[in-house]
Structure formats: C-alpha cells, structure tokens
C-alpha cells in the first residue's frame, strides 16, 4: 500500500481467483484514543472499533472510503484504491491502445517546436467518476523540472457504438534551450482513477522524437504566363522555432483532387516556394518536416486550384 | 558565447555541403546498424544516450545562434580554449566567436573519427563479420575536416592488446552512432545558420 | 497487370512525320499521367512530354515544342505521340511510360524503333 | 534545365559483390529522384522513388539515398538478373532529365 495522495491509499493486488489480497492496517488521524468507529462509504454498518482497522483488501468491494467516527463525529477518512496485476502485469483498462507508432500506446505526445513546450493526449470510453493527474520529469534518475497543467477533456467522438473521449495535457519543460542536444528523455506520468480502481501509465521520449510542425501558413498561388504551371509560395508557421536559418523545414507540395486515388503533381523543397501542374478540381497542398531530423510531417495547409 | 551576424557571404560557405553528406551518411550508417544489428538493442529507445565529447568540446554553447542567446537556459559557463584558424571562415569579417564554434565542430569530428577507427579495426576481427563501418561515412568525415583545416594535434589511434568483446563493441557502435547523428544534425544546423546570414 | 504495348517499328524519311501509339491495358486509362521518353542510339534517356488522359492538358519539353504532339483516345486507351519535321537525329528508340504520379514513372512501355533515313 | 550526371558510366562487378552507383545534379532538387533499370530490348522499370523510397515488388538489395545534388543507387549483392543499365531522373522542375546511365558488367 502506498500513499497516491493525502487520505487517498492505493492497494496494489495480484488479481486472480481465490488470491489472498493484502491485509492493510487504517489508522485514525485524530488524538483520540476510545470510542472510535469505522465505516465504509455510505454504509452506516460498523466495521470495526478502535483506533486501528485491520482489513483484508482482495475485491472492489473492500475498496472505498474508510471513516472513523466519535459520537457522530467523522474524524478522518482514507480512501482506498485497488491497482490490479494480473499474470505480473498492471491493468490497464482505463485507457484505450492507440496502437500508433507500436502497440501499448496509451499516451500519446507531440511538440510544436523546440521550446520544451509538448502536448500530450489519451483516449477513453468512460465517461464518469474519472480524474487524472499528470507528473513530468526530465531524467528520472536525477529528474530536472517539467510543469504540468491540469489534464482537460479535449474532444469527444463516436466510434461505432461507443463514444470515446480524448482528454490531454500541456507541459513545459522548466529551464529548456531549443538547440540543446537532449540525452535524457522526458518521462511522463498518468495517474488514473475510475471509481475505485487506480492505474497508471507512462511515456518516455526525447522532443527531438515528437516534433509536429504546425501546418505552413499564407498559401499563395501565381499562375505562370503561357503555361499550365503555377507557383505556390508560403511561409514557415508561427509557432515553428527561431531562426529558420538554423530551424530549418523542408516541404512537400502535392497537388491532387478529392480522392486519394487520383492522379498527382508531388515535389519536395527546401524553399518556401515551388512550381506545380494544376488540375480543374484540384487542391495544392502543402506540410513541413524539420529538415535535419525526420520526425511526424505537420497536417496539410491546402489551397483549391482554381 | 555564441555565432555573431557578420558571417560569410550567401552561398559562399564551403562547408554546407559537406555537413549535408555528413548527417546523411551517419544516418544511412545508422539505419544500416539498426537492421544488420536487429537482435541487439540499438533503437533510440533502447540504448544509453553517451556523449563521448561532452566536457571536451562544447559545440551546442559556441555555435549558439545570436537569437538564442537571450536564453538563459542555452548559455552554458563551460569554457573551452580553441585553436583559431580555418578555411570554412570564407572571410575576414569572421569572429573569434564563429572560429571557436568550427573549432570545435572539428574537435568533434576528430574524437568521432578515432572512435569509429578503432571500433572498425575490432570488428573487422570478428568472425561472425557482421557489421563494419562504411568507409563513405569515415571519408565524408575527413573531407569535412578537410574544409574546416584547423591544425590540431593528431589523437594516437587507441589500441588495445585484449581480445574484443564483439558483443559489447557492436553495442558501443550503436551509442555511438546515436550520438553522432544527433552532433550531424547540430552541425548541419550551424552550417545552415552560417551560410543565411 | 498494367501494360503500355506500343506500335512497330518505323523507317521515316528526313522532314517527314511519324506517328507511334501506346495501348494501355489494366487499370482506367484517364486515372495516369502518360509520357513520351525517346532514346537515341548511345544517348541517354530524354523526356519529350506528357498528356493528362481526362482533360487532354499536355506539356512539351522546349526543346520538342513545336514539333511534337502527344494526344490520347479514351474510348481505346491509346495515346499518341506524333512527331513531324523529322531530321536524322531523331532515329531513336521512343517509349510511353505512365504514373498517377505527374514527375515520374512506374510501368513503360517496350519501345518502339523510329530510323530516320534517307 | 537541370543536368544530371552519373558515375561510374560503366561498372564492372562480381556477382555477389556490392554496387553503389553516385547520380549528381546540377543544382538542388531535394529528394526529387527517382531510379530506374534497363534491359536491352525490355521495358524499363522503377526501382527507387524520391531518393529513397522502396517500389513493391523491387527486391530489398536495391537502396537509394541522398538529398539536394548528391545521390546513390546501391544495390547490396549483386545478382546475375541485375547486370543491366541504371539511370537516375530528376522531377524537381521541367523538363525531366535523366542522367546517361551506368552500365553494370560482370567482371
């Protein structure tokens, strides 16, 4: 048993049939020595006297709120959560496998640009008496500062007959310099509470590893004189890091219609600007990839043809 | 301390092109690595992030761009003395700051160049014959150093009388690799920032 | 299986005209790009044109412009390359070759010899 | 136009033995490169798009890379089908060129 927070106690339990559980000890956070009482959650039941409860923790029944009493007088509470290991590894039923980049991925991180500044989201199909609370850390052995905020439900989608729930979180590194050369990952730490049952989940990257380029910005298109071609131009996005001359991007330009099946005009460039074929009912698109290390390639910005 | 603005002229940086090969030979090599070494961990993820020039040279600090030295968190106190002279400079309006920054690029690239000399030799000796550096990646080194042409005391190849432990060595290639990818990239970033300005 | 099967083999005579089909069979005709590439004999590849099958939009390399005229047939998914004003450096071997992709290539055609003599 | 030159033009190796094959451009053209073999009297076929992308179907010992002037066609180990003419195209710009071809024999 450990503490998750004040009052609030996880029970890690093999889960299995007819297994032992753990045997925790509660104690009353008050002077008091006679005349104490305990029940668990709404239940008016007496469990116990003493300043002490001993319990058998083996199912969810036995977890929940614990409060000791005097005279009609609630003293203290300890709220216990169960963290589940089945066949030596931890559940992890809370939180959906995103299966990208590998399977067992719960969490998910990108980052903009080089600031220390990341974003990273997790996917569920509950939708009550849930809560999360996010750690961060540069190293873990000697851990350098990383501020969470709070995680927030970011959007919500139908899948099928489900609903899911995309809920994320915001972090920055404390004391980051865009060109440093990271040899420590960032960890990241999911605390998830449903009801009852605890869980937690990890993610270990280097920022390098989760860049995402916002989308280039201002798409411009020139047709060129006596000619099917057209030149597009646009510029590095906002919020990509400074100077571009030592940040670099590289593009893809695309130009193709509706389906993805359909015929293409497809040029790469290290410039903010490139000559195209463009189709009736087309669209010129375009995305940007840090250009000395391949990391995700942004979203695309795209323009019609016509 | 960090690049200054006044820098060659655009497009005149001998050195840009070199870098260019450089990163994508490292990286070729270490793609290369990942495949043949399959069974040993060599991912990103499964390694030890060792920088073998750390404390020996500060690349990062001394090429830091103007903009960024508003950063607290990207000035580093570590100073390092270096030696000042080189063809890459393609000017006299070239700093002392700009020369401590491609001095030490080569100190780098010279540290590389014994380690990945002295791994080769080892695992040339491998029965299995496994995996070996490609000698692309070895050259463009070289050539870079070439273009850089700072004088530099040469460092002895170490050698080493015990048998290898080939196990070990491809793993140390794996590090090794990682970590020099990661310096290519840096040193491509300040060859591209050299030759904007 | 995707197949570009060309016309025969022709003699032309200098300040003529010749004109070389290329049939497409597999896949929907109007869904490539289709190209024109000619190789003289021990000259490297040369990239003459391109037509786009469903608008008839085409683009000539300047160096062909004026003389050549690619075309295309939906209705049997053939296109044509016609080239007039024949001169004797103009014997070469002319293949089609097809893509979704615009800049490039991935199914050609066998080739078709064109000998300009008089 | 851009001007793509290839070296060697001629390449004798064993069977069995590796190839590389260098293609130059005449002024950056990115990743825009592609690779393609030639048999004489057959089609040619797509062995390499943009630089280093792998064609289905096209064994793994062909590999591309390179970006901006630089690039190079290897194939690993060459086997008795892969003696043939390899030639190297570029799609940044129009006209598309091509480089002359490299010839690989068997030494």
């Known amino acids: 048993i450990w503490e998750l927070k004040k009052d609030v106690y996880v029970v890690e339990l093999d889960w299995y049939p007819d297994a032992p559980g753990e045997m925790v000890v509660l104690t009353c956070d008050t002077p008091e020595e006679d005349g104490i009482t305990w029940t668990l959650d709404q239940s008016s039941e007496v469990l116990g006297s003493g300043k002490t409860l001993t319990i058998q923790v083996k199912e969810f029944g036995d977890a929940g709120q614990y409060t000791c009493h005097k005279g009609g007088e609630v003293l203290s509470h300890s709220l216990l959560l169960l963290h589940k290991k089945e066949d030596g590894i931890w559940s992890t039923d809370i939180l959906k496998d995103q299966k990208e980049p590998k399977n067992k991925t719960f969490l998910r991180c990108e980052a903009k640009n080089y600031s220390g500044r990341f974003t990273c989201w997790w996917l569920t199909t509950i939708s009550t008496d849930l809560t999360f609370s996010v750690k961060s850390s540069r190293g873990s052995s000697d851990p350098q500062g990383v501020t969470c905020g709070a995680a927030t439900l970011s959007a919500e989608r139908v899948r099928g007959d489900n609903k899911e729930y995309e809920y994320s979180v915001e972090c920055q590194e404390d004391s980051a310099c865009p060109a440093a050369e990271e040899s420590l990952p960032i960890e990241v730490m999911v605390d998830a509470v449903h009801k009852l049952k605890y869980e937690n989940y990890t993610s270990s990257f280097f920022i390098r590893d989760i860049i995402k380029p916002d989308p280039p910005k201002n798409l411009q298109l020139k047709p060129l004189k006596n000619s099917r071609q057209v030149e597009v131009s646009w510029e590095y996005p906002d919020t990509w890091s400074t100077p571009h001359s030592y940040f670099s991007l590289t593009f893809c330009v695309q130009v193709q219609g509706k389906s993805k099946r359909e015929k293409k005009d497809r040029v790469f460039t290290d410039k903010t600007s490139a000559t195209v074929i463009c189709r009736k009912n087309a669209s010129i698109s375009v995305r940007a990839q840090d250009r000395y290390y391949s990391s995700s390639w942004s979203e695309w910005a795209s323009v019609p043809c016509s | 301390r960090n690049l200054p603005v006044a820098t060659p002229d655009p497009g005149m940086f001998p050195c840009l092109h070199h870098s260019q090969n450089l990163l994508r030979a490292v990286s070729n090599m270490l793609q290369k690595a990942r495949q043949t070494l399959e069974f040993y961990p060599c991912t990103s993820e499964e390694i030890d992030h060792e920088d073998i020039t750390k404390d020996k040279t500060s690349t990062v600090e001394a090429c830091l761009p103007l903009e960024l030295t508003k950063n607290e968190s990207c000035l580093n106190s570590r100073e390092t003395s270096f030696i000042t002279n080189g063809s890459c400079l393609a000017s006299r309006k070239t700093s002392f700051m700009m020369a401590l920054c491609l001095s030490s690029i080569y100190e780098d690239l010279k540290m590389y160049q014994v380690e990945f000399k002295t791994m080769n030799a080892k695992l040339l000796m491998d029965p299995k014959r496994q995996i070996f550096l490609d000698q692309n990646m070895l050259a463009v080194i070289d050539e870079l150093m070439q273009a850089l042409n700072f004088n530099s005391e040469t460092v002895p190849q170490k050698s080493s009388l015990e048998e290898p432990d080939f196990y070990k060595t491809k793993i140390k290639l794996c590090i090794l690799l990682h970590a020099f990818r990661i310096r290519a990239v840096t040193i491509d970033r300040v060859m591209s920032y050299l030759n904007a300005s | 299986q995707v197949q570009l099967v060309q016309s025969g083999a022709e003699v032309k005579k200098p300040g003529s005209s010749v004109k070389v089909s290329c049939k497409a069979s597999?896949?929907?005709?109007?869904?490539?790009?289709l190209h024109w590439v000619r190789q003289a004999p021990g000259q490297g590849l040369e990239w003459m044109g391109w037509?786009?099958?469903?608008?008839?939009?085409?683009e000539y390399a300047p160096k062909f412009q004026g003389r050549v005229t690619i075309t295309a047939d939906e209705s049997t998914s053939t296109a044509y390359m016609e080239l007039s004003s024949l001169r004797s450096e103009d014997t070469a071997v002319y293949a089609c070759?097809?893509?979704?992709?615009?800049?490039?290539?991935?199914?050609w055609g066998q080739g078709t010899l064109v000998t300009v003599s008089s | 136009d851009i001007v793509m030159t290839q070296s060697p033009l001629s390449l004798p190796v064993t069977p069995g033995e590796p190839a590389s094959i260098s293609c130059r451009a005449s002024?950056?053209?990115?990743?825009?490169l592609h690779w393609y073999q030639q048999k004489p009297g057959q089609a040619a076929r797509l062995l390499i798009a943009?630089?280093?992308q792998s064609i289905s179907g096209v064994p793994s010992r062909f590999s591309g890379s390179g970006s901006g002037t630089d690039f190079t066609l290897t194939i690993s180990s060459l086997q008795p089908e892969d003696f043939a003419t390899y030639y190297c195209?570029?799609?940044?710009?129009?006209?598309?060129?091509f480089g002359q071809g490299t010839k690989v024999e068997i030494k």
């Open positions: 002024q950056s053209i990115s990743i825009n």
């Open positions: 195209q570029q799609s940044n710009s129009f006209p598309l060129t």
């Open positions: 037509i786009d099958p469903e608008n008839g939009d085409t």
């Open positions: 943009f630089a280093s």
């Open positions: 070759a097809r893509n979704k992709e615009l800049r490039y290539f991935d199914v």
């Open positions: 597999g896949g929907t005709f109007s869904d490539y790009y």
